[in-house]
């Protein structure tokens, strides 16, 4: 015979636990239904009646199956140095991240307390380590044979173009100038940018190796955003 399905509320067998999406109510000493994300427990269960759930009010949320008496308050509106990357809904908190060109200098438990603008590398210097959502840009001097002529948080040092006849030799902040109408091969077709940090979650970018004689074509791209951490409403 198939096992009889118990409907909530029910008294669990001694030593057993309640099923998924149920919780044990200490007062009623019964297994009772949890409320779904976006809801909270309006009335707790008794021996004869199950949990009564109600929708979260505006600006409040529950992210998980729960039996909390009140929904959690969404965080305050994003400040001027941040952008809202996830809106406050009944099922999720608002997420604020630093705007493009900024990084989270001071973090808090959830989100960012204070954003700061990314440093930029000046001419003669290139990006050694790009900024991430939680770390600043690191610059390095352009090695002999390479240059950067920009003030940028993304540009790396690029190799000088190779000339048949050099009119003006390149230096750390300027490309070589050729006398012939065109160089034998242009090593620097355009500014090479490191990927900008995408303002969602922290990412791990690796430093791009310094090009020695030939430009690198395989840049290490940042990994995609990691999934958000689970909320704290209990499962």
């Amino acid at each position: 015979l198939p096992a009889q399905v118990a409907f909530t509320p029910y008294a669990p067998e001694p030593g057993s636990t309640c099923r998924l999406r149920e919780y044990y109510d200490q007062t009623a000493q019964m297994c009772c239904s949890k409320c779904s994300p976006g809801q909270h427990a309006k009335v707790f269960c008794t021996k004869t009646s199950d949990t009564v759930c109600d929708s979260c009010e505006d600006s409040t949320y529950t992210q998980l199956w729960n039996w909390v008496p009140e929904c959690l308050s969404c965080g305050s509106r994003c400040s001027s140095d941040q952008v809202e990357t996830q809106a406050c809904t009944r099922e999720q908190n608002r997420i604020c991240t630093c705007r493009p060109g900024w990084y989270c200098a001071l973090s808090k438990q959830e989100g960012c307390r204070l954003c700061a603008p990314l440093r930029k590398c000046r001419p003669g210097f290139g990006v050694a380590r790009p900024g991430t959502e939680t770390s600043d840009v690191v610059c390095k001097p352009c090695a002999p044979g390479t240059f950067s002529n920009t003030t940028s948080s993304t540009d790396i040092c690029r190799p000088h173009q190779i000339c048949n006849v050099v009119a003006i030799p390149g230096n750390a902040s300027m490309d070589a100038v050729c006398t012939s109408t065109s160089p034998t091969r242009s090593m620097a077709p355009g500014a090479v940018h490191l990927p900008q940090p995408v303002s969602t979650r922290s990412q791990h970018t690796q430093p791009t190796p310094e090009p020695s004689t030939a430009p690198s074509t395989s840049f290490l791209l940042p990994m995609g955003p990691s999934p958000p951490a689970e909320g704290s409403t209990g499962d």
């Epitope: 400040s79 200098a105 001071l106 930029k120 000046r122 210097f125 920009t150 003030t151």
Partner: antibody
């Protein structure tokens, strides 16, 4: 030579308006953030607003309350501060300032390494 | 974030040492700068990131501290050090109550 020069200050009547200019030279203007900072006679420094030309972002101190607007003319390498509803409390020397260009190769917008000489604004009744 | 500087004024003898304190109302890690301002001039950056010396600043000027407590120390004080000194946190946005401290006047005797 990296330089910032303010202009447009002067005497203005209570409730009046004034537009200050900050002309930049010798810097990569489109990549540098510019802030306005003021100093009332005998008082301390007070940050007003900033603008980042390459990101087009602006922000203001809370006390500004919509009375001031920061803007820029990229072609002229100039940042402006439009001030309205001026009161006696706005009497100050107004400085424009930009980030710190370090010898180790970076430009850090968090700190003010380059300042203009300032322009005096006097609000009289 | 609110920045509070102490003392408001301090006097020092030539060759002596001056210590100026700056307190942040909340943790700002090491995102702090110090400036020197003389009458009729704009401020000059002395220290950034709490302890790094700006270009051209003599090594007798020292910045220290992190979190909420910061100190500027000038040793071997010279007449030229007579000025007002300001601290500044690196987060100038509309969320900041005061970006700069109130200033400390240094008088050299």
């Amino acid at each position: 030579q990296e330089q910032l020069v303010e202009s447009g200050g002067g005497l203005v009547t209570l409730g009046g308006s004034l537009k200050l200019s900050c002309k930049a030279s010798g810097i990569d203007f489109s990549s540098y953030g510019i802030s306005w900072v003021r100093q009332a006679p005998g008082k301390g420094l007070e940050w007003i607003a900033y603008i980042y030309p390459d990101y087009g972002s602006t922000d203001y101190a809370t006390w500004v309350n919509g009375r001031f607007t920061i803007s820029l003319d990229n072609a002229q390498n100039t940042v402006f501060l439009q001030m309205t509803s001026l009161t006696a409390a706005d009497t100050a020397t107004y400085f424009c300032a930009s980030g710190y260009a370090s010898s180790s190769g970076y430009y850090d917008p968090k700190y003010f390494g380059l300042w203009g000489p300032g322009t005096l604004v006097t609000v009289s009744s | 974030i609110k920045m509070t500087q102490t003392p408001a004024s301090v006097s020092a003898a030539v060759g002596g040492t001056v210590t100026i304190n700056c307190r942040a109302s909340e943790d700002i890690e090491s995102y702090l700068a110090w400036y020197q301002q003389k009458p009729g001039q704009p401020p000059k950056l002395l220290i950034y990131d709490a302890s790094d010396l700006a270009s051209g600043v003599p090594s007798r000027v020292k910045g220290s501290g992190s979190g909420t407590e910061f100190t500027l120390t000038i040793s071997g004080v010279r007449c030229d050090d007579a000025a007002t000194y300001y601290c500044q946190h690196g987060f100038y946005t509309s969320r900041s109550d005061s970006v700069f401290g109130g200033g400390t006047e240094v008088v050299v005797k």
